[in-house]
């Protein structure tokens, strides 16, 4: 349904009319200062040029000020994530001002119309910030704009239009359609604040990408590759309700960015770390777990500002729910020789044993073919903190790459019944922890017995020389 202002042009016309003939219309953007953690409390509505509500509602001029900016809405109501974020900010920053930017009338439109309204809303926020800057003790450096979906681009416009530089903008899965590949002044970009950090959780290289794929901040974090989020599959959605729909999956993955941010606020003791990498495939191979030269960072609220970084793509794995933190390990396995392997591609499984806990049996994801007489790198992650690793159990299975290969193997086996068993020779496994940056080499328990057949197990223990402690930790990143 049409709103008093509608698209930007109408608003501009309205604002430029002489005061005497301006029609009596309410602004389509309002600023709700959340004065209580109680989500049902009405809060206080701030009004440009009116100082009384600031005083009445206890606006703290010297404290941090958060502006939460929602996105496009089909329902015309605030979505359920909003009060979770408000509550989490109040919990973490007790003295902070938390302002919800309500632009529902302009967002409850056709998506294209809502996109056209983002500039207007950004302008309204900038005007509010300009007015607040006129007050003593209010600093733009203490302002943190948090925008979800379309709201992330609204935050970008606000940062662009404001007089001065906003301290920080966090983009929570910024909207993709109509923004992908757009000019930097027409979308969220690193120029919009002193620090722009972005979480991408629903990006797709095929079909419609609800979230923007391109990096748009100083640091751009792609949890689980930025696409398929654990706990959001159709099966998971089906499990939590009578019927699961693609819409629910989309909502789950898109909104995951908000929950990751909330997690970073409330589970301060369980920070998730992301690692700089050129692309998702390289990260999946486990070759990007370095913290040297600011190559790793906390995600969400705890992210550290990285100087001289722009469009730095970072990756991590997460759990399916809060707390989202996992423990990343790089595993380097040197496969010395194949024996009677034919066309069979091995799939490795490891079980990690630590001082605190033991992991489940973890498959090593094969991104590329396993190379013989070469070091193969894998990424594994555990949901629990294992402590210091003590030993590793390795098994493998032969997985045929196609039905044709399976037939070839079967035919080969039938024609050579005395064919000796397939074997791999693995003497050591090198492990690096992403979270602690410690490196460790594990040697086969029995150096004389390093061949392993499918379904059999090989045990590895810390090599005699123990830990090879290479401290790669960056001074700007506090690792646990």
């Amino acid at each position: 349904s049409p709103t008093p202002f509608g698209p930007e042009g109408q608003l501009a016309d309205e604002l430029h009319k002489p005061k005497a003939i301006q029609t009596e219309v309410k602004p389509s953007v309002r600023f709700n200062l959340r004065t209580s953690k109680d989500p049902e409390h009405e809060g206080c509505y701030l009004s440009l040029g009116h100082s009384q509500p600031l005083e009445d509602c206890g606006f703290n001029m010297t404290a941090k000020t958060f502006f939460i900016i929602h996105g496009w809405t089909m329902s015309g109501i605030f979505e359920n994530w909003l009060h979770k974020l408000v509550s989490a900010l109040h919990t973490r920053e007790k003295d902070a001002n938390v302002v919800v930017v309500d632009w529902l009338p302009l967002a409850h439109q056709l998506y294209t119309d809502a996109v056209n309204n983002t500039r207007v809303v950004g302008h309204s926020i900038a005007r509010m910030l300009d007015w607040l800057q006129e007050k003593d003790d209010f600093s733009l450096g203490n302002v943190h704009l948090i925008g979800y979906s379309l709201g992330a681009h609204v935050a970008g416009y606000a940062g662009n239009f404001v007089k001065g530089t906003v301290g920080r903008i966090t983009g929570l899965d910024p909207a993709g359609p109509m923004f992908e590949g757009a000019d930097i002044h027409k979308r969220l970009s690193p120029d919009d604040a002193d620090f722009v950090d972005v979480l991408h959780t629903y990006t797709r290289s095929f079909g419609l990408s609800i979230g923007i794929q391109m990096p748009v901040g100083h640091i751009d974090i792609y949890p689980n590759g930025g696409d398929f989020q654990p706990g959001c599959g159709l099966n998971d959605v089906l499990g939590s309700m009578a019927y699961g729909t693609i819409t629910e999956v989309v909502k789950c993955e898109h909104e995951r960015a908000v929950h990751l941010f909330v997690d970073s606020l409330v589970n301060q003791d369980k920070p998730s770390f992301a690692f700089q990498c050129t692309d998702s495939n390289r990260f999946k191979k486990g070759i990007c777990l370095s913290c040297r030269k600011n190559r790793c960072n906390s995600i969400g609220y705890n992210a550290k500002k990285m100087r001289n970084k722009r469009n730095s793509k970072m990756y991590l794995k997460t759990r399916a729910g809060m707390p989202f933190r996992v423990y990343h390990y790089q595993m380097k396995i040197h496969v010395f020789s194949y024996k009677n392997m034919g066309e069979i591609e091995p799939t490795f499984y490891v079980t990690l044993y630590g001082t605190n806990a033991d992991s489940q049996t973890l498959p090593l994801e094969i991104v590329e073919r396993i190379e013989q007489n070469a070091t193969n790198t894998f990424l594994v992650y555990t949901e629990e903190d294992l402590g210091d690793l003590l030993k590793i159990q390795l098994t493998w299975e032969g997985a045929s790459q196609s039905w044709y290969n399976l037939w070839k193997e079967l035919r080969s086996y039938l024609s050579q019944p005395h064919n000796p068993g397939r074997e791999l020779n693995i003497r050591r496994i090198r492990v690096k922890s992403g979270e602690t940056q410690r490196k460790l080499t594990f040697c086969a328990e029995d150096p004389e017995n390093t061949s392993i057949s499918p379904g059999r197990e090989l045990w590895f223990r810390k090599c005699r020389d123990g830990w090879r402690m290479k401290n790669e930790t960056s001074p700007t990143v506090e690792l646990p």
Epitope: G43, I77, F78, V100, Y243
Partner: antibody, heavy 120, light 111 residues
């Protein structure tokens, strides 16, 4: 003290129009949305929709699109429900109920109710 | 739309005893740690009154003999001990998504 006071009972003929009022007091009218709920005689509660009291944007439930209209007189802190082209099945008690914009959106304050009887 | 099924449709309980009303949702009404399920009491000729919000929180001015529980798709309202003034119809409601829907109601009578 928060109150929602509704207009009195109405007796109408089929095809006529009725307009019910809901006057709010004790809180800032524009800071909470207003729901409308129908209760047919001896039946349960059915949500008709709501109106954003700040922007004036109404939202109608599937069964209440067309003949039903929500409106506001913000200066008088009053919400209205108008039913056009009344039918016999519109005979019911209509309640206004306040809901927050944030949080869990339950209906914490209810109007006194207005009984509409449609009979030829 | 989310369908809420209340049981039993009517219930007769002796004074001082416990009354338990069930409400089953066609899909989960949980969001994170919150349940968007609420309970209302309606006495004859009166508007409904909020009793319990978010599954287990007592609304302002409601006596402690009313309690709510449950999560996901299964919720209960308990009244203990039942008093004469509790004779009414009780409705559950979900607000996890629009349209908000109500259960069919449970009529409580005194035995």
């Amino acid at each position: 003290q928060i109150h929602l006071v509704q207009s009195g009972p109405e007796l109408k003929k089929p095809g006529e129009t009725v307009k019910i009022s809901c006057k709010a007091s004790g809180y800032t009218f524009t800071n909470y949305g207003m729901n409308w709920v129908k209760q047919a005689p001896g039946k349960g509660l059915k949500w008709m929709g709501w109106i954003n009291t700040y922007s004036g944007v109404p939202t109608y439930a599937g069964d209440f699109k067309g003949r039903f209209a929500f409106s506001l007189e913000t200066s008088a802190s009053t919400a209205y429900l108008q039913i056009n082209n009344l039918k016999n099945e519109d005979t019911a008690t209509y309640f206004c109920a306040r809901r927050g914009y944030y949080g869990r959106r339950y209906f914490d304050v209810w109007g006194t109710g207005t009984t509409v009887t449609v009979s030829s | 739309d989310i369908v809420l099924t209340q049981s039993p449709a009517s219930l007769a309980v002796s004074l001082g005893q416990r009354a338990t009303i069930s409400c089953k949702a066609s899909q989960s009404v949980d969001y994170d740690v919150d349940s968007y399920m609420h309970w209302y009491q309606q006495k004859p000729g009166q508007p409904p009154k909020l009793l319990i919000y978010a599954a287990s929180n007592l609304a302002s001015g409601i006596p402690a003999r009313f309690s709510g529980g449950g999560s996901g798709t299964d919720f209960t309202l308990n009244i203990h001990p039942v008093e004469e003034e509790d004779v009414a119809t009780y409705y559950c409601q979900q607000t996890i998504e629009d349209p908000p829907t109500f259960g069919g109601g449970t009529k409580l009578e005194i035995k």
